[in-house]
């Protein structure tokens, strides 16, 4: 098909982060067209010669796909007609980080938008009471992080207290030689208090909370991606 008008269409992307070894999503939406056959989606990456992915005439067109993305990309084909050009990236690699462009051509015109994609490793921490220790001790463990994060302890009772003198953090390289297991131990813990183990790098921030009372132990964790509007 040809573009007869000279209009530009609105394309919107969202900065995001990928967890290496897992699947990721590069988000992109556009003004939809009524005919699927009139929509072309091209994903590009700065510094890469071939295409990351191309979808045209209702199907994938991968003849110009770059080798580094071979077999790892897919669009949500059934959602293209409603303006979803998001890309699913399988088995995210550290080298997938960078600037991407979502380039759209429809019968209404063309448009594009860039997005920054960060890659690393991040995981939920789990905080437990270490019964093997000689004193009351908490152990915070998170299996996969990269780049190396910072670990900070906090407590509800002693707000603003600095626990660096009574804690010890270690990083153990995992078998794939990229990500690391994070282990942090907090000593001299008092009961009837809630402690938080906060792990953070430039991609994600995760917190593991543990409430220790004489009668019970309650745990809660959450993880938040940084610099992402999603």
């Amino acid at each position: 098909f040809g573009i007869s008008g000279r209009h530009s269409i609105t394309v919107t992307t969202v900065a995001s982060a990928g967890n290496i070894g897992e699947d990721g999503i590069l988000s992109c939406t556009f003004e939809p067209d009524i005919k699927l056959s009139d929509i072309v989606i091209q994903w590009l990456k700065e510094g890469v010669l071939g295409l990351v992915h191309e979808f045209k005439e209702g199907k994938d067109e991968l003849s110009e796909q770059d080798e580094m993305f071979r077999g790892r990309t897919a669009v949500f084909a059934d959602q293209v007609i409603v303006g979803n050009a998001s890309l699913r990236l399988k088995n995210v690699q550290l080298t997938d980080a960078g600037t991407y462009k979502c380039y759209i051509i429809t019968s209404k015109g063309k448009g594009n938008a860039n997005l920054e994609y960060k890659t690393g490793a991040f995981s939920m921490p789990e905080v437990n009471v270490d019964y093997n220790a000689s004193s009351e001790t908490l152990r915070c463990e998170a299996p996969r992080w990269f780049p190396q994060p910072t670990v900070v302890w906090a407590s509800q009772v002693d707000q603003g207290a600095n626990f660096s003198e009574v804690s010890n953090t270690s990083f153990e390289l995992n078998s794939e030689n990229v990500t690391m297991k994070v282990v942090s131990v907090l000593y001299n813990v008092t009961i009837n208090n809630t402690y938080s183990c906060m792990i953070e790098n430039d991609i994600a921030k995760a917190t593991g909370d543990i409430k220790v009372t004489e009668s019970e132990i309650k745990r809660r964790s959450h993880l938040q991606l940084l610099n992402s509007k999603a």
Partner: antibody, heavy 117, light 105 residues
Framework: EVQLVESGGGVVQPGRSLRLSCAAS????????MNWVRQAPGKGLEWVSA????????YYADSVKGRFTISRDNSKNTLYLQMNSLRAEDTAVYYC??????????WGQGTTVTVSS | SYELTQPPSVSVAPGKTARITCGGN??????VHWYQQKPGQAPVLVVY???DRPSGIPERFSGSNSGNTATLTISRVEAGDEADYYC????????FGTGTKLTVL
């Protein structure tokens, strides 16, 4: 300031070799794909070759395929063009240019290659 | 392979508008870039992605692209705009137009 400076041009006999260099500064060289473009005397621009940021992928114009090799050393912020089996029609000003998506946003000042017996 | 055709020359009086065309099969579906090259100098990007202008390029330079023709428009032409102009697209390599010499009368 973003800058590209070519060097290595000169006069060479047909069939001989020459290596051009392009020193980059003012940007993260290892993040960007690069190109070589040439211009014969009194003629238009002709794309020669492109290389990905990592150096793992390269494309060539049909006119130089099998004779020219593009490469890069990201630790030295330098782009290269190894030109073998040179012909008279390879005589041109050779520019290195930084690739930006589907175009080129920064060009060097060029280095002149003359192939003559 | 993909080909781009430009008029060899365009002449315009100072203060008037110059239009340089670039023809290619369904070029409207491609992203077109324009370069200005003055004698003895390297090319300079003046318009990218059909109609966007790099910083430092005057607003007098604009571009459009539809159907089989992309157009570079230079309004209020000045003597300093006299140069060769090249359109370019990507098609598994950089494809350049044949070039247009802009003469300011």
């Amino acid at each position: 300031e973003v800058q590209l400076v070519e060097s290595g041009g000169g006069v060479v006999q047909p069939g001989r070799s020459l290596r051009l260099s392009c020193a980059a500064s003012g940007f993260t060289f290892g993040d960007r794909a690069m190109n070589w473009v040439r211009q014969a005397p009194g003629k238009g621009l002709e794309w020669v070759s492109a290389i990905s940021s990592s150096g793992t992928t390269s494309y060539y114009a049909d006119s130089v395929k099998g004779r020219f090799t593009i490469s890069r050393d990201n630790s030295k912020n330098t782009l290269y063009l190894q030109m073998n089996s040179l012909r008279a029609e390879d005589t041109a000003v050779y520019y290195c240019a930084r690739k930006r998506w589907y175009g080129m946003d920064v060009w060097g000042q060029g280095t002149t290659v003359t192939v003559s017996s | 392979s993909y080909e781009l055709t430009q008029p060899p020359s365009v002449s315009v009086a100072p203060g008037k508008t110059a239009r340089i065309t670039c023809g290619g099969n369904n070029i409207g579906s491609k992203s077109v870039h324009w370069y200005q090259q003055k004698p003895g100098q390297a090319p300079v990007l003046v318009v990218y992605d059909d109609s966007d202008r790099p910083s430092g390029i005057p607003e007098r330079f604009s571009g459009s692209n539809s159907g089989n023709t992309a157009t570079l428009t230079i309004s209020r032409v000045e003597a300093g705009d006299e140069a060769d102009y090249y359109c370019q697209v990507w098609d598994r390599g950089m494809i350049f137009g044949t070039g247009t010499k802009l003469t300011v009368l």
